[in-house]
């Protein structure tokens, strides 16, 4: 069964400024990465970033950077001022759409004991 | 405009085979996933086949696997779907779709389909 | 499988009253469900993506609603153009499924 990884860090720079990584472990053609904060992209949540391998990448503030990492893993950097800012407890949410097996997803968040720089 | 035509329906009798096409136009074919999706006559929607837009993966239903083959040709902008030992109950039209990646999957275009009868 | 269950299953209004369709799912879909339109000796056609946005070139009297299992086709002011069948669809996991349809008339 095809599972998704999440990890979030804060960066030790900028305290306020955070790191999201998500992995897809699963066969099948990733087709579309969504990255949301707030809950699941279904559920509430809003999109921070949609990642497609051939049509591009598109992001919202306070998202700043979206990238591939490998063709199964993605990072996104955020933005750590101003009023759209995250919070130590935000929930981030990652959703891979893999043709034809479907989508999955997986939510984490900065543990409330982290120290900044420390991975989820 | 996004066109899909397909041909090569007819009547067969059970246990033979029929070659589907869908000739594509419009857009870039290469870059979408493509199924197949038939109905029984007065009956409801049934994904019969899918193939990536890669090529690398496919899915078939317990109904049709190991009967029907679905395959593409990115440089024909053709989608085909090969049809052996049929049965009465394969007997439905044969629509040709696109999945749309940013629309959650969903099938945005479609065919006018052809029709595939089985009987002796 | 996910099984998605509409309901229901044939519903007659009025013209220029609201039609409600429901579609059930067997379990969580998250916001991968689709809404198609199918008129007779024509192929469906996406009025709905994502739970709730409208394809290109749908009329803004359809919309969509719902999240997790349970989701609603609305026609706000039927038309007599909206007569047709309409099917629910979810794309979130292998193998997609459809519901079994409605069948919408006139009253």
């Known amino acids: 069964t095809p599972e998704v990884w999440v990890q979030v860090r804060m960066e030790a720079t900028e305290l306020s400024s955070f790191t999201i990584r998500c992995g897809f472990l699963g066969s099948g053609s990733i087709s579309l990465v969504t990255v949301s904060w707030g809950g699941p992209n279904g559920a509430g949540g809003t999109t921070l970033a949609v990642l497609h391998p051939e049509r591009g990448i598109r992001q919202w503030a306070p998202a700043r950077q979206a990238r591939w990492e490998t063709q199964s893993s993605i990072s996104l950097i955020l933005e750590g001022s101003g009023a759209s800012s995250p919070c130590a407890n935000t929930t981030f949410c990652c959703k891979f759409a893999s043709f034809p097996e479907g989508s999955w997803e997986a939510c984490g968040s900065l543990p409330p004991s982290s120290d900044p720089g420390l991975s989820a | 405009e996004v066109q899909l035509v397909e041909s090569g329906g007819g009547l067969v009798k059970p246990g033979g085979s029929l070659r589907l096409s869908c000739a594509a136009s419009g857009f870039t074919f290469s870059s979408y996933h493509m199924s197949w999706v038939r109905q029984a006559p007065g009956k409801g929607l049934e994904l019969v086949s899918a193939?990536?837009?890669?090529?690398?993966?496919?899915y078939y239903p317990d109904t049709v696997k190991g009967r029907f083959t679905i395959s593409r040709d990115d440089a024909e902008n053709s989608l085909y779907l090969q049809m052996n030992s049929l049965r009465a109950e394969d007997t439905a039209v044969y629509y040709c779709?696109?999945?749309?990646?940013?629309?959650?999957?969903?099938?945005?275009?479609w065919g006018q389909g052809t029709l595939v009868t089985v009987s002796s | 499988d996910i099984v998605m269950t509409q309901s229901p299953d044939s519903l007659a209004v009025s013209l220029g009253e609201r039609a409600t369709i429901n579609c059930k799912a067997s379990q969580s879909v998250s916001n991968d469900v689709a809404w198609y339109q199918q008129k007779p000796g024509q192929p469906p056609k996406l009025l709905i993506y994502y739970v709730s946005h409208r394809f290109t070139g749908v009329p803004d009297r359809f919309s969509g609603s719902g999240s997790g299992t349970d989701f609603t086709l609305t026609i706000s002011s039927l038309q007599a153009e909206d007569v047709a069948v309409y099917f629910c669809?979810?794309?979130?996991?292998?193998?997609?499924?459809f519901g079994q349809g409605t069948k919408l008339e006139i009253k």
């Open positions: 779709s696109r999945h749309e990646d940013y629309f959650g999957f969903a099938m945005d275009s």
């Open positions: 193939i990536s837009r890669d090529g690398d993966s496919t």
């Open positions: 669809h979810q794309a979130y996991r292998s193998p997609w499924t």
